[in-house]
Interface confidence: medium
């Protein structure tokens, strides 16, 4: 559906609401809700980030 349409999502889509802001919106992502600690490596570290860390926002 076109942006702003009220058509329901396609069948089988996850029941979690889509929290992405509308196109062009300046609303920031939902910060502070991640359950992961700050997993960015220490400065100067060559270690890779921890496995599967997708919920910790990297704001660098």
């Amino acid at each position: 559906p076109a942006p702003g349409s009220t058509a329901p999502p396609a069948h089988g889509v996850t029941s979690a609401p889509d929290t992405r802001p509308a196109p062009g919106s300046t609303a920031p992502p939902a910060h502070g809700v991640t359950s992961a600690p700050d997993t960015r490596p220490a400065p100067g570290s060559t270690a890779p980030p921890a496995h599967g860390v997708t919920s910790a926002p990297d704001t660098r």
């Epitope: 502070g32 600690p37 700050d38 400065p43 860390v53």
Partner: antibody
């Protein structure tokens, strides 16, 4: 060279208040979540509080034992993190450390808090 | 309350490989617990060794490595040195708070 320097500890009576400070250098402080951890002979190491980034609206989390009594805050312009401690109890006695970065890479030397009458 | 359990004491010899473990009372430790390992030397000198289960902090010798072994987090020192004698703490993340273990006193007989 990364450094974390705590200050503000001392002797306080039960029910009293105290504010600890930690100044960081050697890394981009504003990019990293910071924690306070305390150590006592009775409880060993105990995580106290965490503060996230400006982009996280400076979200905070606390250990159950200090919720409602302690407040963590930060001033990125001063590369500093603080711990305001109110209604102190004898069991809050210990050495308090600020620590952080991926996730406890760096530690200060600690500042001692003694709660006693 | 969640309890994180470590061996109270271990003894090794220089050049040997020793593994310290960290168990959670909630069940298996996973990468979502972001296991950390911290070393304490005399006079309350703390140094972070491992973050996020297996990431070495800057300047930490390669002989220190973090992993998951079975249902526990583990710190392995491959080729222990006398200067590795210290107390080692693990910390586990539980959604919005950390819990530290009681520490393992490692003795390196020289």
């Amino acid at each position: 060279q990364v450094q974390l320097q705590e200050s503000g500890g001392g002797l306080v009576q039960p029910g009293g208040s105290m504010k600890l400070s930690c100044v960081a250098s050697g890394f981009t402080f504003s990019n990293y979540w910071m924690n306070w951890v305390r150590q006592s002979p009775e409880k060993g190491l105990e995580w106290v509080a965490e503060i996230r980034l400006k982009s996280n609206n400076y979200a905070t989390h606390y250990a159950e034992s200090v919720k409602g009594r302690f407040t963590i805050s930060r001033d990125d312009s001063k590369s500093s993190v603080y711990l305001q401690m109110n209604n102190l109890r004898a069991e809050d006695t210990g050495i308090y450390y600020c620590t952080g970065v991926g996730q406890f890479a760096y530690w200060g030397q600690g500042t001692t808090v003694t709660v006693s009458s | 309350d969640i309890v994180v359990t470590q061996e109270s004491a271990l003894t090794t010899s220089p050049g040997e490989t020793v593994t310290l473990t960290c168990r959670s009372s909630t069940g298996a430790v996973t990468t979502s617990n972001y296991a950390n390992w911290v070393q304490e030397k005399p006079d309350h000198l703390f140094t972070g060794l491992i973050g996020g289960t297996n990431n070495r902090a800057p300047g930490v010798p390669a002989r220190f490595s973090g992993s998951l072994i079975g249902d526990k987090a583990a710190l392995t020192i491959t080729g222990a040195q006398t200067e590795d004698e210290a107390i080692y703490f693990c910390a586990l993340w539980y959604s919005n708070h950390w819990v530290f273990g009681g520490g393992t006193k490692l003795t390196v007989l020289g």
